[in-house]
């Protein structure tokens, strides 16, 4: 049995999420569970720091992209949303909230604005943006 989850505000098209093929969860109520990750889209616009705080308050973090295979549903995300990728001026690296460094070839980085934070957009693209610019955001929780 497959559950057709269609979130018009988040995805470009209908996203099929398996319910019985393998157990996924637990996730907070109304979050999407997919391949051992919980995701939620928040459509209120906040700057990066406020978005991070919002995710943390729900025991989650901003979206971390770590695998094109495990996170293939992200291909279909529409518009732009804050993710947990930031530039660290002290060492010049781009890293995730957990301190891990951005893996090469995982995201196509577009230097859209002069900033130190990044927005996620469809097809594994990251758009550099000023951290103080308000945007919608995606929170993520690992289930394992």
């Amino acid at each position: 049995i497959w559950s057709a989850v269609f979130l018009n505000s988040l995805f470009n098209q209908e996203v099929q999420i398996p319910l019985t093929e393998s157990y996924c969860g637990p996730c907070p109520k109304n979050w999407i569970c997919y391949k051992n990750n919980c995701y939620q889209f928040f459509d209120e616009s906040k700057n990066w720091y406020e978005s991070q705080a919002s995710c943390m308050s729900q025991n989650a973090s901003l979206l971390k992209v770590y695998s094109k295979e495990d996170q293939d549903l992200l291909k279909l995300v529409k518009s732009y949303h804050w993710m947990g990728l930031v530039h660290i001026p002290t060492n010049g690296s781009w890293q995730w909230e957990d301190g891990s460094i951005l893996s090469p070839n995982l995201l196509t980085i577009i230097e859209m604005q002069k900033g130190d934070c990044a927005l996620y957009a469809s097809s594994f693209k990251g758009y550099i943006e000023n951290c103080s610019t308000p945007n919608t955001y995606i929170c993520m929780q690992r289930t394992v």
Partner: antibody
């Protein structure tokens, strides 16, 4: 190899118009800010302006804002500089350049075009 | 606009000499993000300019370590520890902190 190939330069009469082009190879221009800089004979480099990847932000040198229009066509991987009401002092070698803004640690011009010469004369 | 003043405009050297070029900005070029976007470019005869130094003191990839940048606020310096023939050309300082961005007038490094 990353290259920015420029064209469109030449002789133009005072008061006339000209459009310079910059075509990229080995690089996807749609990911980067691009700039134009010129060097007049016997003078130094002068920054004209810059444009961001989706053309939502374009910055010009105020003294040149009414003379130049910077645009881009990401589908064709090209950058353009429209010149209008040219005068003799616009005679120069014009460069298109990629400017990196890869986080606040990395702001710089790293790939320069071949340059194209514009001569304003009657 | 930020005026970038380079000195000297001409610098005659012998190969192996140390060379020093000064660049002064008419106001602070510390960006609101705390960084100072002072860059140095070299234009050799018949070539497009090339990046040497960014953010005051960072050498760009492939630039020999005989090139070094220093300074802060409004006073900046480019030093070449031992000049080689391939170093001859016109050096420009550039500020990318405040729009409109501006170049110095250039310093011509030439043989005595």
């Amino acid at each position: 190899e990353v290259k920015l190939l420029q064209s469109g330069g030449g002789l133009v009469q005072p008061g006339g118009s000209l459009k310079l082009s910059c075509a990229a190879s080995g690089i996807d221009l749609s990911r980067y800010w691009m700039s134009w800089v010129r060097r007049a004979p016997g003078k130094g480099l002068e920054w004209i302006g810059e444009i961001n990847p989706d053309s939502s932000t374009i910055n010009y040198a105020p003294s040149l804002k009414d003379k130049f229009i910077i645009s881009r066509d990401n589908a064709k991987n090209t950058l353009s500089l429209q010149m209008r009401k040219v005068r003799s002092e616009d005679t120069a070698l014009y460069f298109c350049i990629r400017r990196r803004y890869y986080g606040s640690s990395y702001w710089y011009f790293d790939v320069w075009g071949t340059g194209t010469t514009v001569t304003v004369s009657s | 606009d930020v005026l970038m003043t380079q000195t000297p405009l001409s610098l005659p050297v012998s190969l192996g000499d140390q060379a020093s070029i000064s660049c002064r900005s008419s106001q602070s070029i510390v960006h609101t993000n705390g960084n100072t976007y002072l860059e140095w470019y070299l234009q050799k005869p018949g070539q497009s300019p090339k990046l040497l130094i960014y953010r005051v003191f960072n050498r760009f990839s492939g630039v020999p370590d005989r090139f070094s940048g220093s300074g802060s606020g409004t006073e900046f310096t480019l030093k070449i520890s031992r000049v080689e023939a391939e170093d001859l050309g016109v050096y420009y300082c550039f500020q990318g902190s405040h729009v409109p961005f501006t170049f110095g007038a250039g310093t011509k490094l030439e043989l005595k």
